[in-house]
């Protein structure tokens, strides 16, 4: 036979040496070059010529080494679905979208297709931090010891309790998961009706 180093070359077992950059063309029983990202097949290969590639037109792309005869149409991020653009479409990459702030991905099909509002975390809790923002709905976890969070919010974080002594004050009432420590001037007694506030 006639061993060849570059496509097109004969393939007896229907596999090609470089699976990423070559493909098996069954009519001619050969391995041919794929087109690089940002291009498409303008003329198919044969035993006598390799694949001919052309650049994707404006507003279209192909992300991978391919043997597609067309480029994919760029699509905008749909704000109605709660998406926003983080990077524009190029010939080599589709528009990069993410969920708008305060939203999470509720429908996933290779990429996020629909975002919904994050659930509120009640007082005394905060949203567990995730590796990737917008990937899932909030999972509320209790504030750890010495911290509080006093609102219903999808994004508020638990804050450390105020340390009265750092301000030259004394503790009038201890902090809870839902409220801060109450401090008072060490010289003044705390009136009974003024709990939960800091007196100067």
């Amino acid at each position: 036979s006639q061993p060849q180093a570059v496509p097109p070359y004969a393939s007896e077992n229907q596999t090609c040496r470089d699976q990423e950059k070559e493909y098996y063309e069954p009519q001619h029983r050969i391995c041919c070059s794929r087109c690089p990202p940002g291009t498409y097949v303008s003329a198919k290969c044969s035993r006598i010529r390799d694949t001919v590639c052309a650049t994707c037109a404006e507003n279209s792309y192909n992300e991978h080494w391919n043997y597609l005869t067309i480029c994919q149409l760029c699509r905008p991020c749909d704000p109605v679905m709660g998406l926003e653009e983080i990077a524009p479409c190029t010939s080599k990459r589709k528009t990069q979208c993410r969920c708008q702030p305060g939203m999470f991905c509720a429908a996933w099909a290779l990429e996020c297709t629909h975002c919904e509002l994050l659930s509120d975390c009640p007082p005394g809790t905060e949203a567990e931090l995730k590796d990737e923002v917008g990937k899932g709905n909030n999972h509320c976890v209790p504030c750890k010891a010495g911290h509080f969070q006093n609102t219903s919010s999808p994004s508020a974080r638990c804050q450390p309790h105020t340390r009265c002594e750092n301000q030259g004050l004394v503790e009038a009432a201890p902090g809870t998961a839902q409220s801060d420590t109450t401090c008072k001037n060490p010289l003044e007694p705390l009136p009974p009706e003024m709990s939960g506030t800091m007196l100067m």
């Epitope: 036979s1 006639q2 006598i48």
Partner: antibody, heavy 120, light 107 residues
Framework: EVQLVESGGGLVKPGGSLRLSCAAS????????MYWFRQAPGKGLEWVAT????????YYPDSVKGRFTISRDNAKNSLYLQMSSLRAEDTAVYYC?????????????WGQGTTVTVSS | DIQMTQSPSSLSASVGDRVTITCKAG??????LSWYQQKPWKAPKILIY???RLADGVPSRFSGSGSGTDYTLTISSLQPEDFATYYC?????????FGGGTKLEIK
Amino acid sequence: EVQLVESGGGLVKPGGSLRLSCAASGFTFSDYYMYWFRQAPGKGLEWVATISDGGSYTYYPDSVKGRFTISRDNAKNSLYLQMSSLRAEDTAVYYCVREENGNFYYFDYWGQGTTVTVSS
Amino acid sequence: DIQMTQSPSSLSASVGDRVTITCKAGQDIKSYLSWYQQKPWKAPKILIYYATRLADGVPSRFSGSGSGTDYTLTISSLQPEDFATYYCLQHGESPWTFGGGTKLEIK
């Protein structure tokens, strides 16, 4: 000994249909791409259809695309050509042909042919 | 489609003669050319493949040469059984196309 024996030819009216068969023997049929070629009376040879070894891929020239269908049954060592919407210009001897399965892609065995006549 | 131009279309020769038939492709077919012999009422038979290689069982008086677009079939010393029609076929690019044939007749 490799043998390819065609059958199913005959006289058919324009617009009619016919199914050709080819019985293969003497080799592992499922290892080979198979073809149909034809030869009109007093004319040269013409490629008609191709089918891959497993039958997944089929190919046709524009002259028969949409009218002819090649198929195979590897369990029965048989090749078929279903012809429909036949025209006078489809009148020819039809040959069942094996393509060698190495790297040179030539046609090493041909059947004796079956005659198809399209006439009113 | 790749056009295959075969010449001559017919040829008269005598037993013992050296005969040459040529095929010209419309573009470089990278030696993906084979030659077939056909006798009346018979199927074609392979003679030469990949432009120059002799098929199994074919007498050595048959030979093929050429590359690119120009190819030749030579019969070095004609025998009585060689009087037939000869076809070239390109199978480098689909659709596969044949030359028009050369009818070799006894002079």
